[in-house]
């Protein structure tokens, strides 16, 4: 009696169970009563990442430098190429099909989390006592200078964009 289901890594065809091709290989011909499944390795720049009965291998992803992409991990016959973004850029999606420039934190904001190849910069406002006077994708908020520890006094208060200005004691009014 012909089978209705096959074992793992097999497929049903013409009322018989044939072996699937292993990852990295494509199907050339199905098995018969007398022959095994015939498989062939994928060519250069091709891959198949599962046990399969595909007659064509998939093309490796192309990391297009015009889109800011570069190869993070070269593809093999069993794995696709993994793209990432050039330094200072990050992917626009999980599939990393294109890149955008990392966001910079404006003056008055500091970097809470530095961007990675897959996530943008996270900025946070500088609270009182801290400042950032630059637009940067790396700089955190800096603490105001402590005039007291320098035996000076505050001549001008700091803001979220500027440090305090210290001066000598006798300048107190």
């Amino acid at each position: 009696e012909p089978p209705t289901a096959c074992r793992e890594k097999q497929y049903l065809i013409n009322s018989q169970c044939c072996s699937l091709c292993q990852p990295g290989q494509k199907l050339v011909s199905d098995c018969t009563e007398f022959t095994e499944t015939e498989c062939l390795p994928c060519g250069e720049s091709e891959f198949l990442d599962t046990w399969n009965r595909e007659t064509h291998c998939h093309q490796h992803k192309y990391c297009d430098p015009n889109l800011g992409l570069r190869v993070q991990q070269k593809g093999t016959s069993e794995t696709d190429t993994i793209c990432t973004c050039e330094e200072g850029w990050h992917c626009t999606s999980e599939a990393c099909e294109s890149c955008v420039l990392h966001r910079s934190c404006s003056p008055g904001f500091g970097v809470k989390q530095i961007a990675t190849g897959v996530s943008d910069t996270i900025c946070e406002p500088c609270p009182v006592g801290f400042f950032s006077n630059v637009s940067s994708a790396f700089e955190k908020c800096h603490p105001w200078t402590s005039c007291e520890t320098k035996d000076l006094v505050v001549q001008q208060a700091g803001t979220n964009k500027t440090d305090v200005v210290c001066g000598p004691q006798d300048r107190l009014r």
């Epitope: 406002p125 609270p127 009182v128 006592g129 908020c141 402590s146 005039c147 505050v154 208060a157 979220n160």
Partner: antibody, heavy 122, light 113 residues
């Protein structure tokens, strides 16, 4: 110990000005911020602004720019807030409080004056 | 400006009750560099100036009874009175001091049931 003593209650006519004082003792006046807060009758607290007496640096709530002016006299350890062009809606209790002391970690108001009631009425 | 929203606006409770007041800010008050929440709680009795209870969201001001405690982080904060005493009937305010202008919650009045 730290103490902030404010001037007494005032009754003013609409359009006039008033100057509220806040005398500080028990700490270094020049290096600690003086904060000004108001409370209208039956209402909540509203921050007006602050002054660092030693430098004269000020911060104003946008809402009170042109209404309040802060000054300080370090020789007498007294801070002043002048309110101009008074209207009936300026009727409130005005408080001074001590803010940060130069350490940049004490921005909360740990000592308060007793409050000055300013009544604006024709 | 950072908005502060307190709830409830009033609460009726009895002596010995546990009372919880919440405060929500319109932006995070947690600063990543020092891991501090820029939030204070004050108590105000009728005709009196406010009194500082809690600063940095959870630090108890010197001289304040330990039945008062503050908790929370980011945008959601709580003031808890573990066992309400007769002298605790008052109005409570949260206030942020993250960036100018400082703003207060609208207040929560704790009344006798």
């Amino acid at each position: 110990q730290v103490q902030l003593v404010q001037s007494g209650a005032e009754v003013k006519k609409p359009g006039s000005s008033v100057k509220v004082s806040c005398k500080a003792t028990g700490y270094t006046f020049s290096t600690s911020w003086i904060e000004w807060i108001r409370q209208a009758p039956g209402q909540g607290l509203e921050w007006i602004g602050s002054i660092l007496p030693g430098s004269g640096s000020t911060n104003y709530n946008e809402k009170f720019k042109g209404k309040a002016t802060f000054t300080a006299d370090t020789s007498t350890s007294t801070a002043y807030m002048e309110l101009s062009s008074l209207r009936s809606e300026d009727t409130a209790v005005y408080y001074c409080a001590r803010g940060d002391d130069g350490s940049y970690v004490r921005w909360y108001f740990d000592h308060w004056g007793q409050g000055t009631l300013v009544t604006v009425s024709s | 400006d950072i908005q502060m929203t307190q709830s409830p606006s009033s609460v009726s409770a009895s002596v010995g009750d546990r009372v919880t007041i919440t405060c929500r800010s319109s932006q995070s008050l947690l600063f990543s560099v020092n891991q501090k929440n820029y939030l204070a709680w004050y108590q105000q009795k009728p005709g009196k100036a406010p009194k500082l209870l809690i600063y940095w969201a959870s630090s108890l001001q010197s001289g304040v009874p330990s039945r008062f405690s503050g908790s929370g982080s980011g945008t959601d904060f709580t003031l808890t009175i573990s066992s309400l005493q007769p002298e605790d009937f008052a109005t409570y305010y949260c206030q942020h001091y993250y960036s100018y202008p400082w703003t207060f919650g609208q207040g929560t009045k704790v009344e006798i049931k």
